[in-house]
Interface confidence: low
């Protein structure tokens, strides 16, 4: 029998009646077009729904949009289109929701061709009221909020002007022309690239990187010969054209662009690309594309300055610039990432790291699964996860892998069990320990979501036929109950629950189709009565994360410390609640070689924890560029992994000496940088 359908599964008592009393239908008075949904604020219950419908006429397309608001997590909606004067809203800009709980919303309207500028509707009270504002420019991008101050907005215009507002979009000022890309940094700083000659495209590789720290009063040029730039964690990256040829290299700054160092990464040619896969304040995962149209590259992990890099994973699947990669941060357990590699025979395999890219392994075969046809040995195979690449290839995969920081250890994903990803219809698998072990959770493809910090998992079968059944589990996917939420099946389009997985409400979106019309409909189900009581101390159990060998004192040590979590027992049917905070208890570990990456010029042979010198660098002085000076590195091959907190134990020595030589690598050295004021 399928998982969760055998006799020992305990039933949740009277759940049909409890759910029926908490199922709310809303039929939208709309012809079916497109629908977009945004949550406004955290734990506010406010949802905005924008429906748009295009009527193709002979000469032009006539558009109509409607705006709906719910303040009870989607149980009831009110048509508030009149608050935006029945204006057609441009869906490509989406709804720009302010950071944190600012309650701010910006909608960008469609305006007629001859108008001087665009039009926006602004709300700062969680969409209860809107103010119409005509813009002195036509926006090219969605309004971007400063992460530090939601009153500060920036936008690019269709004429490549950089516009800033200091009063939440009421008044706008063009602070610079000829801008290609602009991003907010920390402390309300704006970074942007400018072109001098023709256009962004024509000047690619000859752009300048600018910074303003006072919203456009003064500027500083912080880089030239720029191809592109990016921000990740506390790092500012720029890819810079080399002097002699068409290659480019990554430079990195940790002081907002005042000083730069050349990253110890391979240079790339015109057809190649760099991509920041993940970044935090400690380190960066960087993908470097392989020459040629291979569809793969190499993942490198940085040191704490973003300068020295270690090779982390070869043949990493990443199709083209801005293309597809399966790289996934498993947010439910520290240090865990999943991605795909393209093997020599062009099959795709899933790899997982538990130590922030130090080592990668295949996923363990689920106990309750057999190896499929891709497996050469029917007893030995692995789980392979479907992610962005599979979705882009139109495989029968409705969702990417899912994990939530407050649902500790839980990872849900579509997958197949064999030697490589299979094109067969996938099943859904779950891990409750952050990816170390897996179990088949549901047969066939499903949509899934996590509620109440993991207390409930909800799933809906992915089907081309109309559906009216939802499945839910209160024991992390071991046992499933099915609930018929409507008599009349609907064409399902999506599951929506409040971001953060703390809610107990789930909205099922779809449309009904009759002979004459089709209409949007949503069903919101509140699971509060299924989880009747609040969880108590006895409902939780202690769980040691990353535990692989309980006999070992260093068991669970990852990045120099271990963490014990209080986790809800699978058998407990109770509410974690909206205020649930993950309880964890860390303890520091002794340092071992596993706590060190191989330094510049060193590598780790497979299945060995020792770092050995790269043959081509043997006997050479290790010199590299740091803050525009040449440095000499004295090392025995190790450097501490960024974020590693181990103490004591082994302690390899590392020393960096300043050679007092300049090495600006054609990049602006700090003393040559210019400033100007408006």
């Amino acid at each position: 029998s399928a998982p969760g359908e055998d006799e020992e599964c305990g039933r949740v008592r009277d759940f049909v009646a409890k759910l029926a009393n908490n199922t709310h239908q809303h039929v939208f008075d709309d012809l079916r077009g497109s629908v977009s949904l945004s949550w406004v604020g955290d734990s506010t219950g406010v949802i905005l729904v924008l429906t748009t419908f295009h009527v193709p006429l002979v000469i032009m397309t006539f558009g109509q949009s409607k705006l709906y608001r719910s303040e009870d997590y989607g149980k009831n909606f009110k048509d508030i289109t009149d608050l935006i004067n029945n204006t057609f809203i441009r869906t490509e800009f989406g709804m720009a929701i302010g950071p944190e709980n600012s309650g701010k919303v910006v909608l960008t309207a469609e305006v007629s061709g001859g108008s001087r500028g665009g039009r926006i509707f602004r709300s700062s009270d969680f969409a209860k009221n809107f103010v119409q504002t005509d813009l002195p420019f036509h926006p090219l991008t969605q309004m971007m909020y400063s992460p530090q101050n939601s009153d500060y907005l920036l936008a690019l215009s269709t004429e490549n002007g950089l516009w800033v507002s200091k009063n939440f979009g009421g008044k706008w000022e063009e602070i610079h022309k000829a801008v290609c890309l602009a991003k907010w940094g920390s402390d309300n700083t704006i970074f942007f690239t400018t072109y001098a000659n023709g256009s962004c495209k024509a000047d690619l590789g000859a752009l300048e990187l600018w910074r303003t720290s006072d919203l456009g009063k003064s500027f500083k040029t912080i880089g030239v010969k720029i191809y592109s730039f990016g921000l990740g964690g506390r790092f500012l990256f720029a890819s810079v054209m080399a002097d002699k040829d068409t290659t480019r290299r990554i430079h990195v700054s940790t002081d907002q662009g005042d000083t730069w160092s050349m990253a110890q990464l391979p240079s790339v040619g015109q057809e190649q690309f760099y991509s920041i896969l993940a970044a935090n304040d400690d380190m960066v995962f960087m993908h470097v594309d392989e020459p040629g149209d291979t569809g793969f590259g190499t993942i490198f992990t940085s040191d704490d300055r973003g300068i020295v890099y270690s090779k982390s994973l070869d043949r990493h699947l990443y199709t083209t610039t801005g293309g597809e990669t399966d790289f996934t941060n498993v947010t439910s357990l520290r240090g865990v990432y999943i991605t795909s590699v393209l093997s020599e025979d062009n099959s795709i395999q899933t790899m997982i790291t538990f130590d922030q890219g130090g080592r990668w392994t295949h996923l363990r075969k689920p106990e309750n699964s057999e190896c499929d046809a891709t497996a050469k040995n029917k007893n030995e195979c692995s789980l392979h996860i479907h992610a962005s690449y599979s979705i882009s290839q139109k495989l029968n995969v409705p969702m990417a892998p899912l994990s939530e920081p407050n649902a500790v250890g839980i990872v849900i994903a579509h997958g197949s069990v064999g030697d490589a990803i299979s094109v067969m219809v996938p099943d859904v698998y779950i891990s409750d320990d952050g990816g170390y072990s897996w179990t088949k959770m549901l047969e066939g493809p499903h949509y899934y979501t996590i509620l109440d910090s993991g207390g409930i998992i909800v799933a809906i079968e992915h089907s081309s036929r109309p559906i009216n059944v939802i499945k839910f589990s209160t024991d992390e996917g071991q046992c499933w109950q099915t609930y018929t939420f409507t008599r009349d099946p609907i064409y399902f389009t999506g599951l929506a629950s409040e971001p953060g997985a703390r809610s107990m409400n789930i909205s099922i979106w779809g449309f009904t189709e009759s002979f004459l019309t089709s209409q949007w409909v949503s069903y919101t189900i509140d699971f509060k009565d299924i989880l009747e009581r609040n969880c108590e101390e006895k409902d939780y159990t202690i769980w040691l994360a990353h535990s692989t060998d309980p006999e070992d004192y260093e068991d669970g040590c990852i990045l120099g410390y271990k963490e014990q979590f209080l986790r809800l027992r699978k058998s407990s049917v109770c509410q974690n609640g909206r205020d649930y905070v993950v309880t964890k208890q860390p303890s520091i570990c002794l340092c071992s070689l596993e706590d060190f990456l191989c330094d510049f010029g060193y590598y780790r042979p497979e299945n060995d924890s020792k770092c050995v010198e790269q043959p081509e660098l043997k006997g050479h002085d290790l010199e590299f560029c740091l803050y525009g000076r040449e440095e000499h590195l004295t090392t025995n091959g190790y450097r501490k992994i960024p974020g590693d907190k181990c103490q004591g134990g082994v302690n390899p020595v590392r020393e960096v000496k300043d050679l007092k030589k300049k090495c600006t690598s054609n990049f602006l050295s700090p003393e040559k940088q210019n400033s100007k004021s408006n």
Epitope: P550, E551, E554, Q585, S587, C589, Q647, G648
Partner: antibody, heavy 117, light 108 residues
């Protein structure tokens, strides 16, 4: 019932050596870390050494490193403490304790070691 | 190394009294703390582990509390058999796993 029985204590000359043993019973010995703790006459408890369940990892306070060696024989359910270069300040009752990680949950009755000429 | 400061070093109380012993630690040990009871001529006995969890078979009048750097052992109603010396010990991170200097609880 968990039982830990220390033996091997006695009088030893300064600079001399002694090997203490601890026989464990009533639990699965090879899945627990084990520790030695000592108590000088009229004084408080002092942690001496710890060994991981498989015997791979050993831990000592800096002042005892190099003189004391903790070991175990999981086949015999036995824990050992080798004391070398005995000093007067090593005079104490030595306890062996089961050490699952966040506490020492069972203790032996102790064995007295006296370092004196 | 982490320093443990146990107070008071000695304490006189009567049967039925509520008694509190504190252990202050030189850095955050994230509740990695145990309490032991030792009677004269006997080996120590575990009372509380992970700061707040009572060990098996320990009477409910013994309870642990605290977090960060400050921890407390409370005996809600002192019984004759509770007169003994009490020790705290941390298990935070790497050794040494130091003990407090002890609190001697005597009959008033």
């Amino acid at each position: 019932e968990v039982q830990l029985v220390e033996s091997g204590g006695g009088l030893v000359q300064p600079g001399g050596s002694l090997r203490l043993s601890c026989a464990a019973s009533g639990f699965t010995f090879n899945i627990y870390g084990m520790s030695w703790v000592r108590q000088a006459p009229g004084k408080g408890l002092e942690w001496v050494a710890t060994i991981s369940s498989g015997g791979i990892y050993t831990y000592y306070p800096d002042i005892l490193k190099g003189r004391f060696t903790i070991s175990r024989d999981n086949a015999k359910n036995s824990l050992y403490l080798q004391m070398n270069s005995g000093r007067a300040e090593d005079t104490a009752v030595y306890y062996c304790a089961r050490h699952p990680g966040g506490a020492m949950d069972y203790w032996g009755q102790g064995t007295l070691v006296t370092v004196s000429s | 190394d982490i320093q443990m400061t146990q107070s008071p070093s000695s304490l006189s109380a009567s049967v039925g009294d509520r008694v509190t012993i504190t252990c202050r630690v030189s850095e955050n040990i994230y509740s990695n703390l145990a309490w032991y009871q030792q009677k004269p001529g006997k080996s120590p006995k575990l009372l509380v582990y992970a700061a707040t969890n009572g060990a098996d078979g320990v009477p409910s009048r013994f309870s642990g509390s605290g977090s960060g750097t400050d921890y407390t052992l409370t005996i809600s109603s002192l019984q004759p058999e509770d007169f003994a010396t009490y020790y705290c010990q941390h298990f935070w991170g790497t050794p040494p796993w130091t003990f407090g200097q002890g609190t001697k609880l005597e009959i008033k």
